[in-house]
Amino acid sequence: SIPWNLERIIPAWHQTEEDRSPDGSSQVEVYLLDTSIQGAHREIEGRVTITDFNSVPEEDGTRFHRQASKCDSHGTHLAGVVSGRDAGVAKGTSLHSLRVLNCQGKGTVSGTLIGLEFIRKSQLIQPSGPLVVLLPLAGGYSRILNAACRHLARTGVVLVAAAGNFRDDACLYSPASAPEVITVGATNAQDQPVTLGTLGTNFGRCVDLFAPGKDIIGASSDCSTCFMSQSGTSQAAAHVAGIVARMLSREPTLTLAELRQRLIHFSTKDVINMAWFPEDQQVLTPNLVATLPPSTHETGGQLLCRTVWSAHSGPTRTATATARCAPEEELLSCSSFSRSGRRRGDWIEAIGGQQVCKALNAFGGEGVYAVARCCLVPRANCSIHNTPAARAGLETHVHCHQKDHVLTGCSFHWEVEDLSVRRQPALRSRRQPGQCVGHQAASVYASCCHAPGLECKIKEHGISGPSEQVTVACEAGWTLTGCNVLPGASLTLGAYSVDNLCVARVHDTARADRTSGEATVAAAICCRSRPSAKASWVQ
Amino acid sequence: QDEDGDYEELMLALPSQEDGLADEAAHVATATFRRCSKEAWRLPGTYIVVLMEETQRLQIEQTAHRLQTRAARRGYVIKVLHIFYDLFPGFLVKMSSDLLGLALKLPHVEYIEEDSFVFAQ
């Protein structure tokens, strides 16, 4: 007798666990920026503080009739999903509501900004435990709303936002497109993307993960013990806000980067049917459904990584794409991907003291993506070693020459535009362990890291026959940090990481033309962190 | 994630002589004007003036006051609805779009964003 959504996100071993910190009271506070709410509802009574904050536009229409229960509907339901006594994810959590949406569910960017500033002021006046801000709203892309989210996130606040219900790229909406926000798409009881009339959940690279968002039972503002079902990415975001609140309740010192990495790592993978999304968005959209992760004490010092895609570079000849990790994360590798296969590779460079992953379009190309592998590596010291392109016919080798540094990723960037003359780069795991090897006209970049107990190895998988893609996975206990495509077909689309799987994509025409001798190889660098061990390269 | 996707950015670097004031003539607008790509979601007449990251508290107030003063010289009344101090330096203003060029040339201004709607999801 438990609603499907709670069953889905809270694994069996967590069901009876109390959502409390050791002293018996949760110190986590969730701020909800939404409509007004019915604080007397049994689900949330005693846990919710209705602040005096109110910044909403006038309702449209002269005949609009304000009915309290309708005005409170959206916010009350979400408050219930976060911390409701019976249908809530984080049942013990205290919640503060700020009214930024009117009775028609409309607000403004300026009202939302003033709301976020109100939270910051509250934080300054009376510092408390961990804060989670739930933003179950979306508007068009707003530079200032995203910037405000960034500033608030840098003060230690965790922001969770709805991806949007427009069946569109979430990057076109705010606050969904803010990188510092945990952006949540919606799935149904069958773990499929939510359809809402002719629209549905947003998708794309700006979505961090999905969560239940269809027919969610929660508090209804119609009466103090009423329930109703609502659907949308707001409901999905509320689930993740609840999960985050529970994680912080157990471990109040978890940072945004750790929370996001753990949410991704422990989510249910590959259950969403990606065919629902537009073809060009499928590779960019995470196939992840949120579940409550175990505590860090139960899971040890795992190496956690996530894949961050850049925006599309655009088709111009010198167009570049840039993918960035969060400030706390290490950029362990950089790869690139182009649907046309016309790309000039990828490299890592420092911009404003931060390493970024860059990819370059080639002449005649439709554009590229840079694909960063962003990892949490405690006490890491990482550096990039690069070697300029060698003369024709020669190989370029780069390895990690500092003591105790291991290779976590390779990047290759071709100087020449003519794709027919160049050979693909290679990682040679057997002959030359721990080296990146480039071929004609390629500059080679090696990402080298030192961290206590970090050890890495290369794993390759080649296919000679026709195949659209070649994959290689890191085995259990190892984490994929680098992914490249090795010599084979003259034209590859590039390589990228999907969870612990390295995917090398091959152009259709290349598949048809390829002789059986030209194997396309996916090469993965797999690492693990064993705090007691020394940094090492595993052959 | 945060590249400016489907977003309107308009350069309104209008001739600086337009005001005929010495301190303004020296300041050519490098600030940009931004607004929502979806026309129906725009709220023309309300603008968020975003100042440079390091702008001090007093400078925020001075910039808002300066805009009011210069607008008044042209016969426009503008209303400063809110001043942002804690998350970013800036202010929210209700004014005619005719004054955008003037506002963009104010010192410390990084960009101006037209207010727009957000919706429950």
Epitope: S1, P3, S69, R85, D86, K91, D222, S224, C226, F227 | -
Partner: antibody
């Protein structure tokens, strides 16, 4: 079928704490589908809801009595209890315990009170 | 607090007659109103919930109607066992009960 039975002292002195227990039989108290409630009825008067609790111990009280009421649950004994502090003669009543469907699981039935215990009279007098 | 006022306080009727009981709320309770029957020395029993739905095992002679602030419980033809006190209760905001209507034999 499910039955509820109230127990506790029939006489309590003014300013003391009234304590009652409700024992549930024929079903488990540990279900997310239900709340367990206390309702009272002063002699010859109407009914007044006191408060409710779920199996996790999450409580919900009548605002007018909140400062004096504590409801607790013991799932191992399939019981829930009422404590009402600082009693006066106005607290003299028949005290009923009842089950209420929480509404979270619509299939569990209507979101109202029932079944009820048969009630126990508590008199506040010195 | 939502106050429920029941009228009349006492209704004197003969078996076979039609009984009409009224319950008025101080503010709208939508359709979140129930009717209970209480016989002397017994606990109340749920008759009607959500204004017009009969609870399990309740005879068809009992019916409820109304919404917002005005509600009616109708017993189409009184049986001897129907003589009792009837209470209305709302759950729009917390839980409150009406003062009761006693249906007695004329």
């Amino acid at each position: 079928q499910l039955q509820l039975q109230e127990s506790g002292p029939g006489l309590v002195k003014p300013s003391e704490t009234l304590s009652l227990t409700c024992t549930v039989s024929g079903g488990s108290i540990s279900s997310a589908s239900y709340y367990w409630s206390w309702i009272r009825q002063p002699p010859g008067k109407g009914l007044e809801w006191i408060g409710s609790i779920n199996y996790r111990g999450s409580t919900y009280y009548n605002p007018s009595l909140k400062s004096r009421v504590t409801i607790s649950v013991d799932t191992s004994k399939n019981q829930f209890s009422l404590k009402l502090s600082s009693v006066t003669a106005a607290d003299t009543a028949v005290y009923y315990c009842a089950r209420e469907n929480s509404g979270v699981v619509p299939a569990a039935g209507p979101n109202w009170f029932g079944p009820w215990g048969q009630g126990t009279l508590v008199t506040v007098s010195s | 607090e939502i106050v429920l006022t029941q009228s009349p306080a006492t209704l004197s009727l003969s078996p076979g007659e039609r009984a009409t009981l009224s319950c008025r709320a101080s503010q709208s309770v939508s359709s979140y109103l129930a009717w209970y029957q209480q016989k002397p020395g017994q606990a109340p029993r749920l008759l009607i919930y959500d204004a017009s739905n009969r609870a399990t095992g309740i005879p068809a002679r009992f019916s409820g109607s109304g919404s917002g602030t005005d509600f009616t419980l109708t017993i189409s033809s009184l049986e001897p066992e129907d003589f009792a006190v009837y209470y209305c209760q709302q759950r729009r905001n917390w839980f409150t009960f009406g003062g009761g209507t006693k249906v007695e034999i004329k």
